[in-house]
Amino acid sequence: ELCDDDPPEIPHATFKAMAYKEGTMLNCECKRGFRRIKSGSLYMLCTGNSSHSSWDNQCQCTSSATRNTTKQVTPQPEEQKERKTTEMQSPMQPVDQASLPGHCREPPPWENEATERIYHFVVGQMVYYQCVQGYRALHRGPAESVCKMTHGKTRWTQPQLICTGEMETSQFPGEEKPQASPEGRPESETSCLVTTTDFQIQTEMAATMETSIFTTEYQ
């Protein structure tokens, strides 16, 4: 159920996951000069049920005389059961924070973490694209990508977004609200058997997410 590849890159655009599906793993990586504490977690795991999801495990880094070069690997399912559960929540979370069922929020920063976070996404994960400053969006469909299972293989749908250098007249160039339209299927399906359950559920949740989050916070 893990997605094999990274989401596609779009010229002059950036993407972000607004929430992470249960089953998503985040490697516990430390920046140069630091390493994971001994017996520390290799990864964080988004777990839970439809009403509440949270990140199991905690990433912790400690000073190191030499750079930690241990290669992170995707943990096996049996490893996942043995990990100690520690819910990570940011202090002072606003009461109006919306949550998407079956998803975890971005984990709060941990001390001396690596610059880049390495996520292992699962099927049904959605990421949203926006043009970077100085570029404006030409939409031909949803500016999002979904990890789908097709013919037994995972793939990311192609976001229907083109970012042009022509300056936009609005206040913030290149700013677009993430699109989550249930009817806007980025690519046509073939006649083979396709596992669409996760995608359909995710799309419905994305529509809910747009209503509950974007329309109230992205104004």
Epitope: F15, D96, E106, P108, P109, E111, Q130, E175
Partner: nanobody
Amino acid sequence: QVQLVESGGGLVQAGGSLRLSCAASGLTFDGYAIGWFRQASGKEREGVSYINGRDGSTFYTDSVKGRFIISSDNAKNTVDLQMNSLKPDDAAVYYCAVDRLGSRGAYVSSWWRSPDMDLWGKGTLVTVSS
């Protein structure tokens, strides 16, 4: 876990200046946008300004452009907000916040408009008397 600690709030007369500081010990700055929100009594929390910890690009909401200046010291893990020509409308609790950058280390202003940041400070009160 990283904590955000604000300082520098206080009482100032209209037209005066204040400098807010946010200390983020242990934060890997170049993975985040770091900056400020504010919440006046009875109003929604609004994004004021941020700085991209990787490329140094900045954002200011319209009402503070030309009056506020955000800066960061990545070595000291601090972000400052220099507030000049303060107005009564600027009175609020100011919160330091951080949000993960998008792919390629980029960040867009619409993300900062969300109150749903990755981490919040407890806030510092700014009072502007007329």
